[in-house]
């Protein structure tokens, strides 16, 4: 009945509603139908959120923070529905809401506890700092404080640095991991326990490839079945690291099935893409193509990073000319 938030029933006419920052929620309240309905929603027993009586809203003394953000289900009031539709919740809206309903036959009071969570999609980044390589799991805005765990080759790592910046409403978190010289696979999980939402980033380094100039290279990129759900929107980006920064070669959007290619020598196999295989070919290699190639498959729930190191060597022909 209430699709915009989920709630947990607890004793004493009290319910817990969990909403997401900037989304709309419903604070539920029901009563035994009757005439002369009076509805008063209050926050923390002090601030007027919404009042309805004598068949219409009375918002003259509504607290300004709720202006244009609340409404009732007017066609449902006569059926015993006093629920409050609440627009664009913020973290400041967290707390206890009391719904007072009076009718010609009774008065009831319901309490609803609103908890608000934030979970802007995290990212996993691969960075080179001088001679060091780092994986960074970061989330720009999250609340409450998340649980971050790292695994190396599926084994939990105790080392877990967390750089945290707290703003008025949420946390910004970076968790860097030094992976210099490692060929292991790494996994980072960020969990928001309130929203029951988990995001996973996975990093895999493939064996280095040695190619001759003018040859072509095929680089594999296939999602791990554990994470990948084809009916969920995702984006695939292939990029190449040059002098410490990545430049995008091509990307694919699952929602529109669009492929954008920025490098004329790059090719993607449409049939393979339809089978969720995002391996790519780079034709006519030259020496400057040496470097690291990164395939990034990302959705709201995961990021899968695959790194290939390509070494392009001069062909015999070129070498003999020199």
């Amino acid at each position: 009945i209430f699709p915009l938030a989920f709630f947990i029933y607890v004793p004493m006419n009290e319910q817990i509603v969990i909403g997401r920052l900037d989304e709309d929620i419903i604070l539920p309240s029901s009563f035994e139908r009757g005439s002369e309905v009076v509805i008063h929603w209050k926050y923390q027993d002090s601030y007027k959120v919404h009042s309805y009586y004598k068949g219409s809203d009375h918002l003259e003394s509504q607290d300004p923070r709720y202006a244009n953000r609340t409404s009732l289900f007017y066609n449902e009031i006569q059926n015993g529905n006093a629920s409050l539709f609440f627009r664009r919740v913020s973290l400041l809206d967290e707390g206890i809401y009391t719904c007072y309903v009076g009718t010609a036959i009774q008065v009831i009071t319901n309490k609803v506890v609103l908890k608000v969570g934030v979970f802007l999609t995290p990212v996993m980044k691969y960075e080179k700092r001088n001679t060091n390589s780092f994986l960074i799991c970061s989330v720009l805005s999250v609340y409450p404080r998340p649980i971050i765990t790292w695994k190396m080759d599926n084994t939990p790592i105790s080392e877990n640095n967390m750089e945290e910046t707290g703003s008025l409403d949420s946390f910004s978190i970076n968790s860097p991991l030094n992976i210099t010289g490692s060929n292991s696979s790494y996994e980072c999980t960020i969990e928001n326990s309130l929203l029951k939402q988990t995001w996973t980033g996975r990093w895999t380094m493939k064996d280095g490839l040695h190619k001759m100039q003018s040859e072509h290279v095929s680089l594999s990129c296939q999602p791990v079945n554990d994470y990948f759900s084809p009916n969920q929107d995702f984006k695939v980006t292939w990029s190449r690291m040059k002098s410490g920064t990545f430049s995008v070669l091509a990307y694919y959007l699952s929602s529109s099935q669009n492929t954008i290619i920025n490098e004329s020598r790059f090719s993607w196999n449409k049939e393979l893409i339809n089978q969720s295989d995002f391996s790519m070919n780079l034709m006519d290699l030259n020496l400057s193509d040496s470097g690291e190639y990164l395939c990034n498959i990302s959705s709201d729930e995961y990021t899968l990073l695959t790194i290939h190191t390509v070494h392009v060597e001069p062909s015999q022909e070129t070498a003999s000319h020199n």
């Epitope: 005439s35 002369e36 009076v38 008063h40 209050k42 027993d45 007027k48 009042s51 009586y53 004598k54 068949g55 009375h58 003394s61 007072y100 009076g102 009718t103 010609a104 008065v107 009071t109």
Partner: antibody, heavy 121, light 107 residues
Framework: QVQLVESGGGVVQPGRSLRLSCAAS????????IHWVRQAPGKGLEWVAV????????YYADSVRGRFTISRDNSKNTLSLQMNSLRVEDTAVYYC??????????????WGQGTLVTVSS | DIQMTQSPSTLSASVGDRVTITCRAS??????LAWYQQKPGKAPKLLIY???SLESGVPSRFSGSGSGTEFTLTISSLQPDDLATYYC?????????FGQGTKLEIK
Amino acid sequence: QVQLVESGGGVVQPGRSLRLSCAASGFTFSDYGIHWVRQAPGKGLEWVAVIWYDGSDKYYADSVRGRFTISRDNSKNTLSLQMNSLRVEDTAVYYCARDRSSGAMGYFVYWGQGTLVTVSS
Amino acid sequence: DIQMTQSPSTLSASVGDRVTITCRASQSISSWLAWYQQKPGKAPKLLIYKASSLESGVPSRFSGSGSGTEFTLTISSLQPDDLATYYCQQYNAYSYTFGQGTKLEIK
């Protein structure tokens, strides 16, 4: 059963003050708005003031605004009317009356027996 | 303030008669009108709310009608116990106001 019992009436000189009380029982006091209504001897009824169930809203008739103050103590199930700067025309039987619900409806389902206030020099 | 005017001011009728009291508001009050009965030396008693809803425990010979500015209270068959003064009251807006009352006498 619902009971409202007023007290505190008496004879007072013009310009003086008086405090009326109303003791409530037989219902959950903190769920209901309470009004004061008065009736001058041999005359009709006049609404005086209301306080909502939680004390958040108070409204007064023009004839008493600024002189009378309505208040309630939900922990003691009592309602009060502080009457200052009394005038001869304030002479009346004062009733406390329970609203249908929060105080927002504005009609009177249960009444006390009244207490007489006489303002006279 | 909204003025409420009742008519007649006094009314004399016999037991068993059908009695009608009218109440006029100086501006529209929708259906936000109540009727009270007050017996001598007693507090008023609620009879009708929202113009036509009978309060619990009130005999069914009492009924109310009207909306906007014109309202009536009807006693379908007058009983000796109905000797009282009847008041209408608007609760559309603060300040709440009463009619001046209709005194009903039994012939």
